[in-house]
Structures are given as C-alpha cells and as structure tokens.
C-alpha cells in the first residue's frame, strides 16, 4: 500500500511541467516504493537495484517505456507522440 | 536474421564532417535502443555513443562528446552518426551495434553491424 | 577500465575460461564478444550469462563476486580469437558509459 505525501508542480516554463512527488510505501520484504502505471507501487528490490526501471511497468497502459541512457530514469510515449521524462533522486 | 548495414564512412580530412548511417532489418527497430562502438587501427573496441528508444535520449564517449550527435529515424529504421571537427584519432573502424532486452549497455550488445571505415587524413 | 588477461591458450577439447574484472556494478552483467581478423566482433555472451541462439552452447557466461568468467568448454580449432569483455564505467558527468576491455587472445594449441 502506498500513499503521496507531497506533491509539488511547477510550470513555469513553456510548454513543461516539472513535478516532484514522493511517496510513503509499506512493502513486503523484497520489495521497494516504486512506481507501476504512474502510481506509487510496490516493487522487486532487484529492479530499483539494477535501474530496470522500465521493469516496474511505471507507464499508462497503452504508453510506451524507455530508459533514459544513463539511467536516471524514464520516458513515457503517449501514441500521439507527447512524451514525459521521470528522473529519480 | 539480424541486420545491420552501416555505411558512410571513408577518406576525410581534419577538422571535415561525416554522416554514418546504419539500416537496420529483421527486428522491429524502435523497440530497441541502438548505439555506436569504434575501432582504431590494430586496437580494441571503444563505445561511441548510444541513443534510446525514441530517440529523445543520448550519450557520448568522453572522446567524442561535443563532436559526435546520435539520431534515429525509426520509420526508415535507420542510425546514425554524425560527427564534427574530425582529428586523427577519430580513424577507426565504425561498428552500429543493437542493444538486448530494449537497453544498451556495452554487457548487452547482442547484434553488430559489418563496420564502416573511417579514415581522417591530409 | 576493464582488466582481462593479454592471452589464454588451450589445445582441442579442453576447458579454456578467460576473467574480466572492473566496471561499475550496474546491474546489467559483463557481455563478452568474439573477434576474428578482418570481422566484425560477434557477441557470445551478454548480460553475464544470455547466448544469442547461433552461438555454440559451449561458450557460458559466469559471474563470482567481482570477477566475470567466460568459459569456453571443449574448445576448438576455430575458437581461436580476441575476446573483449565489456561492461560500464560510471562518471558524475556523463553517468553510464559502455567500456570494454583489452582483449584477450585465446589461441588453440
């Protein structure tokens, strides 16, 4: 079970939306605080280990998941082609 | 069967530009993150760069950053490389390389390209 | 960097295995990738342990603490290549960049 705890949103810039979220999981042994279909989820440690992110399933159905390059985290792709970038910290 | 076809290379002299390409077939390209690996001249293999996905993402080896851009077109399910103020040591041959499981890194290469020369010579 | 062994040798149809070590621990395993003369390298392990489907199930990919062994069981004649490991390197600047090792030449006695 998880639940948001904050929830800041800046869009200040044109065009972008900056969101930071956090949230507050409690989650059987390994498993970690995640993200599954653009929710806080629970999920395999190992995934949150190795920066597998895509793994988590952190997308909406129907979007499309990649790793960012250096994997600080992930892009969704919408089918109209909009995408959102999630880095984690 | 896997392809990758790269082609572009050749004679260049220094400070000069190039465009390498790589067409790709047999797999559905933009399911995949793709990326380039080089090799001088009787030496070892050096990763170049890597793009993900969707194209939106990219990386640089340290010896190219600020000279080389990584794109993709994935509807003509093509690669590829173009690189800037060519020296000396940039005479390699060019390798496009596949990543597994949609990711690359150099532990998940799993298909290479014939290679591209690249000669950078006055 | 990665660090391999310059050199392995073995006569036919004996076990030869050659060590990588070094990279960031990424989670993403060592891939090792065979090259002859004049080709293109042709991976044989990636992800520690994963054979493409045309590679011989005598090559095998291991992994025991920080040391990766690629072992190469009833080697053969045509066996005979450099073999690079290749893992990443982790930086403030550019986070994780591909890097390979040396090379090792494994010659068939």
């Known amino acids: 079970t998880c639940e948001i705890v904050t929830l800041d949103r800046d869009s200040s810039q044109p065009r972008r939306t900056i969101a930071r979220q956090t949230a507050r999981c409690a989650c059987r042994k390994g498993q970690i605080a995640g993200t599954t279909r653009a929710r806080p989820a629970c999920v395999d440690a190992r995934i949150i280990k190795t920066k597998q992110w895509c793994d988590m399933l952190p997308c909406l159905e129907g979007e499309g998941c990649d790793l960012l390059i250096n994997r600080s985290g992930w892009t969704c792709t919408q089918p109209g082609g909009r995408i959102k970038t999630t880095t984690v910290s | 069967a896997v392809t990758l076809d790269e082609s572009g290379g050749g004679l260049q002299t220094p400070g000069g530009a190039l465009r390498l390409s790589c067409k790709a077939s047999g797999f559905t390209f933009s399911s995949y993150q793709m990326g380039w690996v080089r090799q001088a001249p009787g030496k070892g293999l050096e990763w170049v760069s890597a793009i993900n996905k969707g194209g939106s993402d990219t990386s640089y080896g340290s010896a190219v950053k600020g000279r080389a851009t990584i794109s993709r077109d994935n509807g003509q399910s093509t690669l590829y490389l173009q690189m800037n103020s060519l020296r000396a040591e940039d005479t390699a041959v060019y390798f496009c390389?596949?990543?597994?499981?949609?990711?690359?890194?150099?532990?998940?290469?799993?298909?290479w390209g014939h290679g591209t020369e690249v000669i950078v010579s006055s | 960097a990665l660090t391999q062994p310059s050199s392995v040798s073995a006569n036919p149809g004996e076990t030869a295995r050659i060590t990588c070590s070094g990279g960031?621990?990424?989670?993403?395993?060592y891939g090792w990738y065979q090259q002859k003369p004049s080709s293109a390298p042709l991976t044989v392990i990636y992800k520690d342990s994963e054979r493409p489907s045309d590679i011989p199930s005598r090559f095998s990919g291991s992994s025991s603490g920080s040391t990766h062994t690629l072992t190469i069981s009833g080697v053969q004649a045509e066996d005979e290549a450099v073999y690079f490991c290749?893992?990443?390197?982790?930086?403030?600047?550019?986070?994780?960049?591909?890097?390979f090792g040396a090379g090792t030449t494994l010659t068939v006695l």
């Open positions: 290749g893992n990443d390197d982790y930086s403030s600047d550019s986070g994780y960049v591909g890097v």
């Open positions: 390389a596949k990543g597994s499981a949609s990711y690359i890194t150099a532990a998940t290469i799993d298909a």
């Open positions: 960031a621990s990424s989670g993403y395993g």
